[in-house]
């Protein structure tokens, strides 16, 4: 309940907000949950705490893990958890699902794409924007404050948009990138019984103990904007939020993509630091809309290390 997922790329700045709120005068202490080690507040450290914020300047893959923040108020301490995953930079252009922020949709009248999480950073305009890894050029694109405006939106404008900016901390500059999908609302549409594209029914997913794992639940619901459509994960028939395991979180915000004109949603289940007991759980990908509910079940199995002979 008091846990938030955050992710970033190695060698980029990442700033994480404590999920618990309080007054500006309240003290906030941060700890690395696995070791219960206090995070320093001195800015000379690469990873340091600054009130409600935890700063990785820059982030490293080894920083991945669960961080605890405690907001100390006069009457009680409020504890929150930040589940941080730092990924290696991809060499190719594709931005994987697990690095995507929530999808936004636009129309001819409203085509603002906000740069995710930018409010946490000390940045100066202009923002750089890319679509499917290509720098955006031309008079139709206007970078304004923390968002991109596209004039005369067309269906071809749908795609993955990346914003890039520089965070400045005490005179040092750090790069930050964030990507989200943009969909264009189609006025003509229809809705179907949900079709789950992934995972396959009764799929067995191989995972390594101690590593992170991601499961993607992906389903399509028809064509055009869907008024009621959702995908979600359940563990042993229980909602993720009620299951109470902070290592296992589903990504907030659902990616709506129009592949082949179909309206599809994704929900990524992130399992941090896979444990033996995770292999005993039943993972259900649920897709539902006005027509009904479809469920695909996944189980995890241990990936056997491959012997390498010289």
């Amino acid at each position: 309940k008091f846990s938030k997922q955050s992710w970033g790329l190695e060698n980029e700045a990442l700033i994480v907000r404590c999920p618990r709120q309080g007054k500006p005068s309240y003290t906030v202490d941060w700890y690395y949950s696995q070791t219960n080690k206090s995070i320093p507040t001195q800015e000379r450290n690469r990873v340091f705490a600054s009130g409600q914020l935890l700063k990785f300047l820059p982030a490293a893959v080894a920083d991945s893990g669960i961080y605890t923040c405690i907001v100390r108020s006069p009457t009680f301490n409020r504890t929150g958890y930040a589940n941080v995953t730092i990924y290696k930079k991809q060499s190719d252009c594709n931005v994987p699902d697990y690095l995507m922020y929530s999808t936004v949709s636009g129309s001819e009248k409203n085509s603002k794409i906000y740069c995710p999480t930018i409010d946490l950073y000390n940045w100066t305009a202009p923002l750089e924007w890319f679509k499917n890894c290509q720098a955006l050029q031309g008079s139709r694109y206007r970078a304004h404050k923390s968002f991109l405006v596209i004039d005369n939106v067309m269906t071809e404008d749908a795609g993955d948009y990346t914003c890039k900016f520089i965070h400045n901390e005490n005179g040092a500059n750090y790069s930050v990138t964030a990507t989200r999908s943009f969909t264009v609302k189609d006025e003509q549409g229809f809705s179907l019984f949900p079709v789950i594209g992934a995972p396959a029914q009764n799929e067995i997913k191989e995972v390594e103990i101690g590593k992170n794992a991601n499961l993607t639940c992906s389903a399509c619901f028809g064509k055009g904007t869907q008024f009621l459509a959702a995908v979600l994960w359940q563990l042993n028939g229980t909602k993720i939020t009620d299951f109470g395991e902070p290592r296992i979180q589903q990504e907030e915000g659902q990616n709506q993509s129009f592949s082949n004109g179909l309206a599809c949603l994704d929900m990524v289940l992130r399992i941090a630091d896979v444990k033996e007991e995770d292999l005993l759980l039943q993972y259900d990908c649920l897709a539902l809309n006005l027509h009904g509910l479809r469920r695909h079940t996944v189980r995890l199995s241990r990936k056997n290390p491959i012997d390498h002979h010289s």
Epitope: K4, R17, Q21, K23, P24, S25, P74, T75
Partner: antibody, heavy 116, light 113 residues
Framework: QVQLVQSGAEVKKPGASVKVSCKAS????????MNWVRQAPGQRLEWMGW????????TYGDNFKGRVTITRDTSASTAYMELSSLRSEDTAVYYC?????????WGQGTLVTVSS | DIQMTQSPSSLSASVGDRVTITCKSS????????????LAWYQQKPGKVPKLLIY???TRESGVPSRFSGSGSGTDFTLTISSLQPEDVATYYC?????????FGGGTKVEIK
């Protein structure tokens, strides 16, 4: 500049529900909690509850538990307060107020009149 | 719940007078963790929205005239208007900003003689 704009006045019958909205602008909505305070005619201010706008966790005053529901929509930078099972003594001006050291920013208020 | 008791409930003073309003809380509003007193003072004019004057018992909110000052610690607090002006006619409320439920005093109505 920081602005909190509330929905318009409402007239409701006893037993009904009312939902008041509070749209925030001029700051990052999820950085600050949002409180709800009401004031009946000629009465003192009365705190109803607040919501953690980042994770959506509400906290309610004991006098309102079970009748009030505070929610938020981060994409619209809007907080909502719904009060159910209305009675005549719920006639009041309802305010949203941004959390901070004291409440420095208030909505303009929404008058809810409960009358049969 | 923390009870907030204000006195007087109303007062009438002349322009230029020094006006003092007191507020007592049923529990201490001092937080030992940072030595802050979580008490706020508001001004509310008829038909208007409350306006924050003082927070932390003694810190004046930005833009508030210097004739308004707050003092006190623990359970006893005071709002002082050093030289009453016609535009100060209003009801003044103290607020427990320390713990839930945040509670307000009954108000002090200030009028000009």
């Amino acid at each position: 500049q920081v602005q909190l704009v509330q929905s318009g006045a409402e007239v409701k019958k006893p037993g009904a529900s009312v939902k008041v909205s509070c749209k925030a602008s001029g700051y990052t909505f999820i950085n600050y909690g949002m409180n709800w305070v009401r004031q009946a005619p000629g009465q003192r201010l009365e705190w109803m509850g607040w919501i953690n706008t980042y994770i959506g966790e509400p906290t309610y005053g004991d006098n309102f538990k079970g009748r009030v529901t505070i929610t938020r929509d981060t994409s619209a930078s809007t907080a909502y307060m719904e009060l159910s099972s209305l009675r005549s003594e719920d006639t009041a001006v309802y305010y949203c107020a941004r959390e901070g050291e004291g409440f420095a920013y208030w909505g303009q208020g929404t008058l809810v009149t409960v009358s049969s | 719940d923390i009870q907030m008791t204000q006195s007087p409930s109303s007062l009438s003073a002349s322009v230029g007078d020094r006006v003092t309003i007191t507020c007592k809380s049923s529990q201490s509003l001092l937080y030992s963790g940072n030595q802050n007193n979580y008490l706020a003072w508001y001004q509310q004019k008829p038909g208007k929205v409350p306006k924050l004057l003082i927070y932390g018992a003694s810190t004046r909110e930005s833009g508030v005239p210097s004739r308004f000052s707050g003092s006190g610690s623990g359970t006893d607090f005071t709002l002082t208007i050093s030289s009453l002006q016609p535009e100060d006619v209003a009801t003044y409320y103290c607020q427990n900003d320390h713990s839930y439920p945040y509670t307000f005093g009954g108000g002090t109505k200030v009028e000009i003689k």
